[in-house]
């Protein structure tokens, strides 16, 4: 058969029909629609839109639409008791506050609900002492203040600059350092670009506003109350004492204004070079403590936030698959919002509603994918990815079995420059080909392809002429489906000039003014970006869901596992006695690299020449490219991570947000030079050497001739 | 819009004390600092002193140490200079103005002037 | 005190036509963090100074482009690319990298 019979497709009903159907008005319209309130995780609000999404993609055309519910632990302030941090004298007296909320931006001054900045799952907990300046809390800023400047933040409330790391890390960072507070503020260095206003005249972070965000250590668990296995009517939850990824210090962000006035006071030792200084004008003397007249002053905090037990609801919906139907490709992305979500998570949403859209009005003109098509609202995802992940552990069965590809759908846009896209090189291709049949939004470059735009504006660092795609990290919805179940997943959004905007993240993420008029007025007044990561988005799911064989290209999974490894082998090398020593080898790993080529290679010509007309075989080559996702994937889990199982990448153990290649290998070598055993760290290293070598080998075998 | 509005013109007589209020409106009194400057007869602008509504935190230039005291209230986001131990030379035009945050940190916003005449 | 000097003491210029006052400080205005905190004010007959130039060479809000600052260190520049009639007044350079202090200041009136 040809494919327009195989999944009962008339001429009209193509990638074209589908990308042509999408339209930015839409997007925009959606947009405004699904930000004129706050939907919290947790909240009636974020229900009430839970039901309306359910009831829209209805009409849409999805076969069926369900809510999945889960009781999971979210964390909230205390309405009547609320977080701040103080400035006590010698007598204990308060002589400076930090402000209670952000100021309402314009229009939003009557707005309910809008939850005041806080740092979810905070314990409770009022300690007073000396401050510390850590700089971003990275594990090299606190290397540096107690092994260089022999700062001990033992007992000390430390303050730390948001940015370059997943918040949850330098939380961690700081417990691990023994300090008893964390206070986290924006420094303009990283949310504050040059020349541009502040909200809002435009798309800078004002010196009241505030980034929320949770600071767990989940590490893939979901639920903290329910790692494994699903937050249903009859699990079983641990108590909180056991808790998994909770902090055990309490925790307050601020912003820029209220971070001046604790860090102007700041005594103690001088920053220890440029890198630390931010823009405020202050010294940013690292402490403890502050300076002269100051000195018997101490710093406060007030935090009463609760964790509480709350019902949160995922969106499913199905469009069923023409001819395989038990072969699912999903497409998801959140719907809760600290506040208002005018970028993050509702510039994603606005574009999946806006999918689900263009679908189902082909559905509706008879047409169906050749694969099952799922679409995910997910709930909870600010706490922790805790609806997606709830979901996936309920369905982890149908998923390892049935999932071919996952693409995420967060926030649409994170700058106006160019495409970003993330994903598993099994995509590399499908995201190449789809990027050369879309037209680029840039401007000079009309008429050009979209390829063409973010090639040139973000080259690839190996490959000329290619566009940089990046690993793989974590901090999103994706993190279940690749890093513990193996399903082959990607990402892509629109995104800021990284080499003249050294701001990290955009300025206004997760704060009140993270707005509709923010998107609106300043970063896609046309909706033009956005419809551009829809037609990204929407295209590569339709290419996953409609394509005869799927549009995974194994020879890019050899070419990166071969880069992977010169890296990994490159670390090592740089203790070359320490190796001689204790015999550590890569000759494992590197060999089942080059069988993993050779077998990757002739799978692919066979790819190229089998008899497409017969549907075992059909079946059997495309099972093999699905399951290669899978086969990197250990049971086992990486050390102390369990829910980390993808053996070539995981989030990074210093920094949620990025991706780690060989990441067992990585961490064992981590610091090595300082552990107390060098034998036994050394061992560790050949174990993950060992690991590494044998799921590389394992998952070529997997693309050799079956008999 | 931020707004600066200072008390009415004083006349005193030598070794007397003078306070001026700022009244501040249309922003977060609490976050930025209050500068207190004056101006004597066809001369230039000379500084007197600061304070932060936030935490009552002063900063005085030296030369008027001891004689000027700058206070707030926040309940009414008001700034007060009283300069005691009046002399004909302190007679000048005295404003108050907003030390700008980051990313100015200049004194972007000033009060209309308040006219303080010491004479006998 | 960091002392400000500025030059000329009064500029007399012709509409349209260029103007430059320049400003020196006793010391350096780099601030530890590496910004210098050098501003300048136009005071306008009769009125309160205003902000023009924030941190050498940031125009402040409303601030028409024709006026523009440079400079660094020691030695800092404010250009009037055209002079305009509603111009005129006297010019202050500031600094508040230190205990703020001003110069004596810069008349601009017209010829």
């Known amino acids: 058969k040809s494919s327009n019979e195989a999944t009962n497709i008339t001429p009209k009903h193509n990638m074209k029909a589908f990308l042509d159907e999408l339209k930015a008005e839409n997007i925009k319209k959606f947009l405004y629609n699904f930000t004129q309130i706050p939907h919290l995780a947790g909240t009636e609000q974020n229900f009430q839109l839970a039901k309306q999404i359910q009831s829209q993609w209805k009409e849409f055309g999805l076969d069926s639409v369900e809510l999945a519910h889960y009781d999971v632990l979210l964390s909230y302030p205390n309405k009547t008791h609320p977080n701040y941090i103080s400035i006590i004298n010698e007598d204990g007296n308060e002589i400076f506050n930090t402000s209670l909320f952000e100021p309402p931006p314009p229009g939003y001054e009557n707005v309910s609900d809008i939850v005041p900045p806080f740092s979810a799952f905070s314990p409770q907990g009022m300690p007073e002492g000396d401050l510390v300046y850590v700089n971003y809390a990275r594990t090299e800023d606190f290397f540096k203040l107690e092994r260089d400047m022999k700062i001990n933040c033992s007992g000390k409330i430390v303050i730390a600059r948001y940015g370059k790391v997943f918040r949850g890390n330098k939380v961690k960072n700081a417990q691990l350092a023994g300090a008893k507070g964390v206070i986290l503020y924006s420094d303009p260095a990283d949310y504050f670009a040059p020349g541009v206003k502040s909200y809002p005249d435009g798309w800078n972070l004002p010196g009241g506003g505030v980034q929320r965000g949770n600071i767990l250590n989940l590490n893939g668990a979901g639920d903290p109350l329910t790692p494994g296995y699903p937050a249903n009517e009859y699990a079983y939850r641990r108590g909180i004492a056991e808790a998994v990824g909770l902090p055990s210090i309490p925790v307050h962000p601020i912003g820029y204004y209220d971070a001046q006035k604790l860090l102007e006071k700041m005594g103690g030792s001088a920053p220890p070079d440029s890198s630390w200084r931010g823009s405020l004008k202050v010294p940013y003397n690292v402490g403890p403590g502050f300076t002269g007249n100051f000195s018997t002053q101490k710093v406060k905090m007030h935090i009463h936030s609760t964790n509480e037990v709350t019902r949160i609801y995922n969106v499913i919906g199905t469009l069923r698959g023409a001819v395989e139907p038990d072969r699912y490709v999903i497409l998801g992305g959140h719907r809760d919002s600290w506040v208002f979500g005018g970028i993050d998570p509702q510039s994603g949403a606005a574009v999946v509603h806006e999918i689900v859209r263009s679908f189902g009005t082909l559905k509706k003109e008879g047409w169906r994918p050749r694969r099952t098509i799922l679409f995910a609202s997910w709930d909870a995802e600010e706490f922790g990815l805790l609806g997606s992940t709830e979901w996936a552990e309920e369905n982890s069965r149908l998923l390892q079995e049935r999932g071919v590809a996952y693409i995420n759908a967060d926030s649409s846009i994170e700058g106006n420059y160019t495409l970003r896209v993330d994903c598993t090189p099994l995509m590399y291709s499908l995201v190449h080909n789809l990027t050369k049949e879309l037209k680029s939004p840039d401007e000079g470059f009309e008429g050009k392809s979209l390829y063409e735009s973010w090639t040139k504006k973000s080259p690839s660092p190996e490959f000329s002429g290619m566009p940089r795609i990046s690993k793989l990290g974590s901090g999103n919805d994706f993190e279940v489906f690749f890093q513990r179940l193996g399903i082959a997943s990607g990402r892509a959004r629109y995104t800021k000039n990284w080499e003249t905007n050294k701001f990290s993240g955009y300025p206004l993420y997760h704060s009140v003014y993270e707005t509709y008029e923010l998107v609106e007025k300043f970063y896609d007044p046309m909706f033009k970006y956005h419809l551009t990561v829809a037609q990204v988005r929407g295209g590569m799911v339709f290419e996953l869901a409609n394509s005869i064989v799927l549009p995974f290209d194994c020879r890019d999974y050899a070419v990166v596992l071969r880069k992977y490894a010169d890296k990994i082998y490159s670390i090592s090398m740089k203790h070359p006695q320490e190796m001689k020593t204790y015999s550590v080898s890569f000759d494992s790993l590197f060999s089942a690299v080059k069988n993993f080529t050779e077998i990757a290679s002739k799978f692919s010509e066979r790819l190229q020449d089998f008899d497409k007309s017969n549907p075992i075989v059909l079946r059997m080559m495309n099972d093999q490219l699905m399951f290669l996702e899978r086969a990197f994937i250990d049971p086992l889990g990486l050390p102390d991570r369990p829910f980390y199982r993808h053996v070539i990448y995981a989030p990074s153990s210093h920094n949620k947000y990025a991706g780690e290649s060989f990441p067992g290998i990585y961490d064992a070598l981590f610091d090595i030079e300082s552990k107390v055993d060098p034998s036994k760290a050394w061992g560790e290293v050949k174990r993950q050497i060992y690991v590494a070598a044998f799921t590389v080998q394992a998952a070529a075998e997997t693309l050799s001739e079956v008999a | 819009q931020v707004q600066l509005v200072q008390s009415g013109a004083e006349v005193k007589k030598p070794g007397a004390s003078v306070k001026v209020s700022c009244k501040a409106s249309?922003?977060?009194?609490?976050?930025?600092?209050i500068n207190w400057l004056r101006q004597a007869p066809g001369q230039g602008l000379e500084w007197m002193g600061g304070?932060?509504?936030?935490?009552?935190?002063?900063n005085y230039a030296q030369k008027f140490q001891g004689r000027v005291t700058l206070t707030i209230d926040t309940s009414t986001s008001t700034a007060y200079m009283e300069l005691s131990s009046l002399r004909s030379e302190d007679t000048a035009v005295y404003y108050c103005?907003?030390?700008?945050?980051?990313?100015?940190?200049?004194?972007?916003?000033w009060g209309q002037g308040t006219l303080v005449t010491v004479s006998s | 005190d960091i002392v400000m000097t500025q030059s000329p003491l009064s500029l007399p210029v012709t509409p349209g036509e260029p103007a430059s006052i320049s400003c020196r400080s006793s010391?350096?205005?780099?601030?530890?963090?590496?910004?210098?905190?050098l501003h300048w004010y136009l005071q306008k007959p009769g009125q309160s100074p205003q902000l023009l130039i924030y941190?050498?060479?940031n125009r402040f809000s409303g601030v028409p482009d024709r006026f523009s600052g440079s400079g660094s260190g020691t030695d800092f520049t404010l250009k009037i690319s055209r002079v305009e009639a509603e111009d005129v007044g006297v010019y202050y350079c500031?600094?508040?990298?230190?205990?703020?202090?001003f110069g004596g200041g810069t008349k601009v009136e017209i010829k």
């Open positions: 103005a907003r030390d700008g945050n980051f990313p100015y940190y200049a004194m972007d916003s």
């Open positions: 249309g922003y977060t009194f609490t976050y930025f600092d």
């Open positions: 304070i932060s509504p936030g935490d009552s935190n002063v």
């Open positions: 010391q350096s205005l780099v601030h530890s963090n590496g910004q210098t905190y």
């Open positions: 941190t050498v060479s």
């Open positions: 500031s600094q508040s990298t230190h205990v703020p202090t």
